[in-house]
């Protein structure tokens, strides 16, 4: 076992001479992004104050390619890198095409309305007039491709003009536009060369040791890894922590059960019920508030102040009133919970599916005519699964090196 341990320690480090270095640099696991949209069936009725009715459409599947660049080894046992992602639509794996039309809340209009709720009426009237003249409505009918990667909207220029620096978009607005062909920030992580216990743990993100999106030091902490590999020699007491730039926070997953993936022993880690719980149910999450119902996290502070919320799909594990407020939601543990299957000896993921939902809080705002009589509701926009499983040559090599050889050596 000590020989095996030595081999593992030698080969999991972030070091050009280690076996896993190329795997770390260019992840050989094929990743897929599956997106499910909530098509709004009754937009006119919602504007009259009726309960929203949605229909899940999808999946729209994209192959996700990741590569690390600007890899710089620092002299404090850390390495800095940028990871770029590109997405390629996979028609054969998808249920529909990127030219499918989806009726969705107009995030720019309804988001701006909620943001302006406490502003003076005169400003709201100017905004209403702007929306009217620019032909903006509370709901929009856009293609999957436009919603994902961006559509031209005169409102984008308007927001940039009147609220300079607030908005990360130029000319076009798309929910995944920021992710495609771009990096997720500069990560600086420990290499494990000098101290294996800190391997993969994030030292800094974009030069920061902590973020300032939230209202408590604990919630602002950058904990865990960058979400791709973890320190080796895990036990069922281990937790899986990582910093997610998309969620603007660290997340902690807990051990659920042992399993086997393609002959390789794994630990399955899942989200605790408290992941998106509000502060009254789980006090450590108070820093993420102000909160609405439990089970959704307000990400407005890191999403250009728009009233956007992150949760499990279909409001799984959330306060039941959220799913009950929208017709067409059916939370299901099997279909909607996230998991990561990790090889505990190396800390390398074998099979994973991270599932999250993005929702918009919308309501009627006096003075913003476009909001009609909308009753306050957290309306799901889409949910996605980022999934990957080790396969082919990589799986074979991994199995040989880390399962077969130790067995042979043992006997």
């Amino acid at each position: 076992p000590s020989l095996i341990k030595q081999q593992v320690l030698k080969n999991v480090r972030i070091d050009p001479s280690s076996l896993s270095f190329n795997m770390w640099k260019e992840i050989p696991i094929p990743f897929y992004l599956s997106v499910y949209f909530f098509d709004v069936m009754n937009p006119s009725e919602i504007l009259k104050g009726e309960k929203p009715q949605v229909r899940e459409r999808g999946p729209y599947v994209y192959r996700e390619f990741r590569h690390k660049s600007n890899i710089t080894f620092n002299n404090n046992d850390t390495v800095s890198f940028l990871e770029y992602r590109t997405f390629q639509f996979q028609p054969s794996k998808s249920h529909g095409s990127e030219s499918d039309y989806i009726v969705m809340p107009n995030i720019l209009v309804l988001g701006a309305a909620v943001m302006m709720e406490n502003k003076p009426m005169t400003l709201k009237l100017i905004m209403t007039l702007a929306f009217t003249t620019l032909g903006e409505r509370a709901f929009m009918n856009r293609t999957v491709g436009e919603i994902m990667w961006g559509y031209k909207d005169p409102l984008v220029n308007l927001i940039n003009k009147y609220f300079p620096g607030m908005f990360p978009f130029k000319d076009k607005f798309g929910l995944f536009a920021e992710l495609n062909n771009s990096d997720s920030g500069l990560f600086t992580v420990f290499t494990g060369v000098q101290n294996i216990s800190r391997i993969h743990l994030v030292d800094k993100w974009n030069g920061l040791s902590k973020v300032d999106f939230w209202h408590s030091d604990q919630c602002n902490m950058i904990n865990g890894t960058s979400g791709q590999m973890w320190p080796p020699f895990m036990t069922p007491e281990s937790s899986l922590e990582f910093y997610s730039p998309e969620a603007c926070r660290s997340m902690k997953l807990m051990y659920k059960e042992s399993g086997v993936f393609e002959g390789i022993p794994t630990y399955r880690f899942v989200a605790p019920k408290t992941l998106f719980a509000n502060g009254s149910i789980y006090p450590p999450n108070e820093g993420f508030c102000p909160c609405l119902e439990s089970g959704i996290q307000n990400v407005s502070t890191c999403r250009f102040s728009a009233p956007l919320f992150l949760s499990h799909p279909h409001f799984l594990n959330a306060d039941p009133v959220l799913a009950e407020a929208v017709t067409g939601l059916h939370p299901n543990q099997e279909a909607h919970s996230l998991f990561l299957d990790i090889h505990p000896v190396t800390g390398i993921p074998m099979n994973c599916s991270v599932k999250l939902q993005l929702s918009l809080y919308m309501k009627s705002v006096a003075g913003i005519g476009q909001t009609g009589k909308i009753e306050p509701v957290v309306l799901p926009l889409l949910w996605f699964a980022e999934s990957g499983a080790m396969e082919g040559e990589t799986l074979h090599t991994f199995y040989t090196q880390l399962v077969l050889m130790p067995k042979v050596m043992h006997y």
Epitope: P120, T122, I126, T132, T133, G369
Partner: antibody, heavy 122, light 109 residues
Framework: QVQLVQSGAEVKKPGSSVKVSCKAS????????FSWVRQAPGQGLEWMGG????????NYAQKFQGRVTITADESTSTAYMELSSLRSEDTAVYYC???????????????WGQGTLVTVSS | QSALTQPASVSGSPGQSITISCTGT?????????VYWYQQHPGKAPKLMIY???NRPSGVSNRFSGSKSGNTASLTISGLQAEDEADYYC?????????FGGGTKLTVL
């Protein structure tokens, strides 16, 4: 060419009400907002309030709150301003003005009516 | 008393340039770019000359220009002409209100 044509001059007794109309022609009425601004003899301009007809959304200057009512009738492309509890200091020319927005920005009081003189006298 | 302060009068000879100032506070002129200038000839309705600090509506001569520094907005008229003689009012958005200056009488000598 957009034009705003207002109703004729009025003479009113103190304590009574006056209703001034403003008919828009040459544009899509529902695309605009309409404001009311008054000018006492030899004085400057004073904003009273406004409306966006398509949503029937109104907004009033605090000074006139409770005394002024702005309405619109989309079928006739006409905006109205009613001022109640008139006093002598309400003697002024009352203007309606169109508010407009386009991709270049916000045009407050972009086009004005010819004005309606309201005289409050006992 | 007006919320925005303008000089009561300015004058200039034909061909000259003049500037009319409009001083407000950090709550109106200084807070937003919603600053407007209107021209009013005697007995006529006002006419919009500058919108959002420095933009000219179509049909307004490029001799008219607007600017803003801190809490003071300015209207400059270059190449003064006889027909420019009128009252000029500035206006700004302020705390749920539209406020006007007291007006400046421009005399072309």
């Amino acid at each position: 060419q957009v034009q705003l044509v207002q109703s004729g001059a009025e003479v009113k007794k103190p304590g009574s009400s006056v209703k001034v109309s403003c008919k828009a022609s040459g544009g899509t009425f529902s695309d605009y907002g309409f404001s009311w601004v008054r000018q006492a003899p030899g004085q400057g301009l004073e904003w009273m309030g406004g409306i966006i007809p398509i949503f029937d959304t109104t907004n009033y200057a605090q000074k006139f709150q409770g005394r002024v009512t702005i309405t619109a009738d989309e079928s006739t492309s006409t905006a109205y301003m009613e001022l109640s509890s008139l006093r002598s200091e309400d003697t002024a020319v009352y203007y309606c003005a169109r508010d407009f927005f386009d991709s270049a920005g916000y045009y407050a009081f972009e086009i004005w009516g010819q004005g309606t003189l309201v005289t409050v006298s006992s | 008393q007006s919320a925005l302060t303008q000089p009561a009068s300015v004058s200039g000879s034909p061909g000259q340039s003049i500037t009319i100032s409009c001083t407000g506070t950090s709550s109106d002129v200084g807070a937003f770019n919603f600053v407007y200038w209107y021209q009013q000839h005697p007995g006529k309705a006002p006419k919009l000359m500058i919108y959002e600090v420095s933009n000219r509506p179509s049909g307004v001569s490029n001799r008219f220009s607007g600017s803003k520094s801190g809490n003071t907005a300015s209207l400059t008229i270059s190449g003064l002409q006889a027909e420019d003689e009128a009252d000029y009012y500035c206006s700004s958005y302020a705390d749920n209100n539209w406020v006007f200056g007291g007006g400046t009488k421009l005399t072309v000598l």
